[in-house]
Structures are given as C-alpha cells and as structure tokens.
Interface confidence: medium
C-alpha cells in the first residue's frame, strides 16, 4: 500500500524508562561478623545498562569492625582511581578520581557502598572494595560491563532483499531471521566500544510474504517485520 515518505513503523519504539537502579548489595540481615569464615574475596561480573544508576557494595562487614575502606577503580585508558576512608580519623582521600558521577552513596562512616549516577559507556572497568579489619583484609571486586541498547532498523533495499541493522550496541547484538534466507552479516566496531551489526538477506522463494528480523541483545530482544515488496530498488525503512 502507498506509504507516506516510503516509511513503515514496524514495532514499538525504543523504550523510555525512568532511570532505573541496580545493585548487588546484601541487606543488613546478611551481614555477618563471621564473614572471614565464609569468603575472603569475591569477584563478580556485572552487566549494567547505560544511563541507569548502579550501586556497588563492599563485603558485608559490620562497620564497627572497620579500620580502612578503599575503593579501587580501574577504567580503560585512565590511571587507577582510589577513594579511601579511614575510620579512626574519619577522613576520606581520593587519588586520580575525576569522574563526578562515581561517588560514595552517603558518608562512608555510615555506608561504604559506591554509586554511579548515571552509568556511562566510559564506566566499563574493574571496581574493587578493600576492607581492612582487625581480622584481616576483605575484598569484593566487580567487572562492570556497561550495556548499550542498539538502535534497530529494518528496510528492503532491493527486490526480495532486506537489511536489518543493530546500530551501536554493546556488546554486539545477534541477528536471526524468520524464515532463513541467503544472508551475509558484517560487524563494524566503534572507538567507544560499541558495535554495529548489519545483516543482509535475500529470499529467492517467491511465496515468502513477510520476513522477521530478530535481534537478540543482553538488554532485551526485539523483533521487526517487513513485507517483501516485488519492486526493484524500492526502499522501505523502519526505524525503532
């Protein structure tokens, strides 16, 4: 059917959510003075969506047993940043920390957690809390992986050929098709760590009516649909 501006809106547009928060913190009930008997060091891989808020937690040690808390932050291409708090003198110290979005959640004598408000693509890296206590040192590390939702488009660029693009996602999205066609997929890597995936498919079978591009990504999946129009050179675009 005739389409204004030759364009088709195919599915709901990219979701707009209020800034979400995520945390791997334990609650007070899980805090134990016998933590040393359980685990001395924990490292967690943590995928977090860009533009959300994240809270990173120290080991569940009661603050009264604390001597020093140190957050060590290693981001790609930057010198190591440390944020330290010494309980005895109630003083905090920062070294090489320039990103104002990474802060203590509140006063470190009340809460040792670190917050990132909001998470940016540059916050990919390793975050480690080191708690010095009379019973020894306890660590909790986070390999923070910032996830970026790709912008997805689908259009027909030639007779019975469709192109599906997942632009600037992190990590790279995966693209599959229903029904399967004769497909070629390319990846383009950007300096900020995002990846654009482009899949071009051709369907020789003439009874294929609509094709579905299914984009799988850690931030969520999307399916787009387009009708194969028998018009050489016709370009129907559909941006999510």
């Amino acid at each position: 059917a005739a389409q204004p501006n030759n364009s088709l809106m195919l599915q709901t547009s990219k979701e707009n959510h209020a800034l979400a928060s995520s945390s791997l913190c334990m609650d007070e009930k899980q805090i134990t003075q016998n933590y040393s008997k359980v685990l001395a060091e924990v490292n967690t891989s943590w995928p977090v969506k860009m533009a959300t808020n994240a809270v990173l937690c120290c080991p569940p040690i009661a603050l009264r047993n604390l001597i020093i808390i140190t957050w060590e932050i290693i981001l790609r291409g930057q010198p190591s940043c440390t944020k330290a708090y010494r309980k005895e003198t109630n003083e905090t110290k920062e070294t090489n920390c320039t990103d104002e979005r990474i802060t203590w959640v509140s006063r470190p004598d009340q809460n040792s957690d670190l917050q990132i408000r909001p998470v940016a693509i540059t916050h990919d890296g390793y975050y480690r809390c080191i708690m010095v206590t009379p019973d020894g040192n306890f660590h909790r590390g986070y390999h923070l992986q910032v996830l970026v939702t790709p912008e997805v488009t689908l259009f027909q660029n030639r007779n019975r050929t469709a192109v599906c693009k997942a632009v600037a996602g992190k990590p790279a999205a995966q693209i599959s098709w229903i029904p399967e066609g004769d497909c070629a997929t390319k990846q383009e890597y950007w300096s900020n760590g995002t990846v654009t995936v482009k899949s071009t498919c051709h369907w020789e079978v003439h009874n294929v009516s609509t094709v579905t591009c299914h984009v799988s990504h850690l931030t969520g999946n999307k399916s787009l649909y387009i009708e194969l129009l028998p018009v050489p050179g016709a370009k129907k675009s559909a941006k999510l």
């Epitope: 059917a1 229903i178 029904p179 009874n207 294929v208 009516s209 579905t212 009708e227």
Partner: antibody
Framework: EVQLQQSGAEFVRPGASVRLSCTTS????????IHWVKQRPEQGLEWIGR????????KYAPKFQDKATITADTSSNTAYLQLNSLTSEDTAVYYC???????????????WGQGTSVTVSS | DVQMIQSPSSLSASLGDKVTMTCQAS????LNWFQQKPGKAPKLLIY???NLEDGVPPRFSGSGYGTDFTLTISSLEDEDMATYFC?????????FGGGTKLEIK
C-alpha cells in the same frame, strides 16, 4: 473511528456469481491492504486473498485463484469480492479485514467487517 | 502451503484457571492470535507472536519461536469463552489454524 461495513446477505443459485462489497471509513483505503477471509458454517477461517488498493495489485490463495476476484475503488473507499461459478461449497460467511500499513500492526488484521453471509442453494 | 496445527481442538476450563493452547507450524513463521465469539467477526489479540494488541486484557499472552507457539490466558474469565485461531503471515498464502474452542465448565 475505523469501520468496515459489508453488504447484506446473499441467496444465490448454483452456477451464478455474486459481488460483495466492503466500504471503509476512518482511514484511507489506498494506504492499506484489504484482505478477504472465508468461514464456512461451524468451520475455521480461510484466507482468500488481498488487494493493494493503491495500485490494484492482488494476491490469492491458490484454491481461490479461479473462484475469487478482488477489486477496489479508492474514490468510494470500497473493496469488492466477486465469487463466480458458485456451488454449495461456497456457502459461507465472507469477511473483509484490513492489513494496516502505517503503524506497528501493519501486518495484522486489526479491524474486520461484520461479515456477509452467502447461501448457495437451488 | 504452511500447515498450522492447533491443539487442542476444544477444551473446557473453570473460571480462574490458567489455560494454554498451542499452534504448530510446518515452517518457521511469525504469527498472530485471534479470538472469535459466536456470530461475530474475529478480533486480533496478539500480533508478532507475543505483542498484545491495544485494548486486550493483560491476562492474554503469547509466546514461542520458529514453529511452536502458545497462547496463554492466566486467569480465565466468563468473557473468554470463544474460539481462538492462529494465523501465519510469513508465507503466501496466509494460513489459519483450525481453531481451539474454549468452553467454561
């Protein structure tokens, strides 16, 4: 408000032809596709075919290729289904429905006519 | 043509029950679900396998991928008594399943 208004019930003799109409309002017929669907008494749904009213292009299910002809008149926002060489097998309710071209349900049959009953009997 | 097998062909359930029905295709497809009440035209419930059409109660949900699809009603209500059809729109000719007739016990 989007509506598809179909013509009234038809009683026809075997071998005759009939033309059913589907007049739309609330949208421009030329922007969308119109499909026709057959439902025999107490049976399932069968896709007959569709038309792109903007250019008259049609697609038919093979079993209806020689039975049905779909046309459209954009000036009156009306689509038609002509059925020829009628037999008792053609006794059914026939629905028109649109395939929306302009938003997320473009490929779905989101609005339907009320149906036209066709009875073929001698 | 793509064959669409719906099962069961009929089912009886009580109010408040969770109800599921399936549609199996002979090819990988995308599909829509419709509800039809006696003497009425079909009504679109779900498009693109899992997307709820505007105005459809959230107790309805669709799932599946490829060739196997499910329509679920999380808590059956009186007004859900109807016949449910699936439709594939990936290949021409478009084809419907044979329907699942849902009755209230």
């Amino acid at each position: 408000e989007v509506q598809l208004q179909q013509s009234g019930a038809e009683f026809v003799r075997p071998g005759a032809s009939v033309r059913l109409s589907c007049t739309t309002s609330g949208f421009y017929i030329k922007d969308d596709y119109i499909h026709w669907v057959k439902q025999r008494p107490e049976q399932g749904l069968e896709w007959i075919g569709r038309i792109d009213p903007a250019n008259g292009n049609t697609k038919y299910a093979p079993k209806f290729q020689d039975k049905a002809t779909i046309t459209a008149d954009t000036s009156s926002n009306t689509a038609y289904l002509q059925l020829n060489s009628l037999t008792s097998e053609d006794t059914a309710v026939y629905y028109c429905t649109r395939q929306l071209g302009l938003r997320r349900t473009w490929y779905a049959m989101d609005y339907w006519g009320q149906g036209t009953s066709v009875t073929v009997s001698s | 043509d793509v064959q669409m097998i719906q099962s069961p062909s009929s089912l009886s359930a009580s109010l408040g029950d969770k109800v599921t029905m399936t549609c199996q295709a002979s090819h990988t497809i995308n599909l829509n679900w419709f509800q039809q009440k006696p003497g009425k035209a079909p009504k679109l419930l779900i498009y693109g396998t899992s997307n709820l059409e505007d105005g459809v109660p959230p107790r309805f949900s669709g799932s599946g991928y490829g060739t196997d699809f499910t329509l679920t009603i999380s808590s059956l209500e009186d007004e859900d008594m109807a016949t449910y059809f699936c439709l594939q729109h990936t290949y021409l000719p478009w084809t419907f399943g044979g329907g699942t007739k849902l009755e209230i016990k």
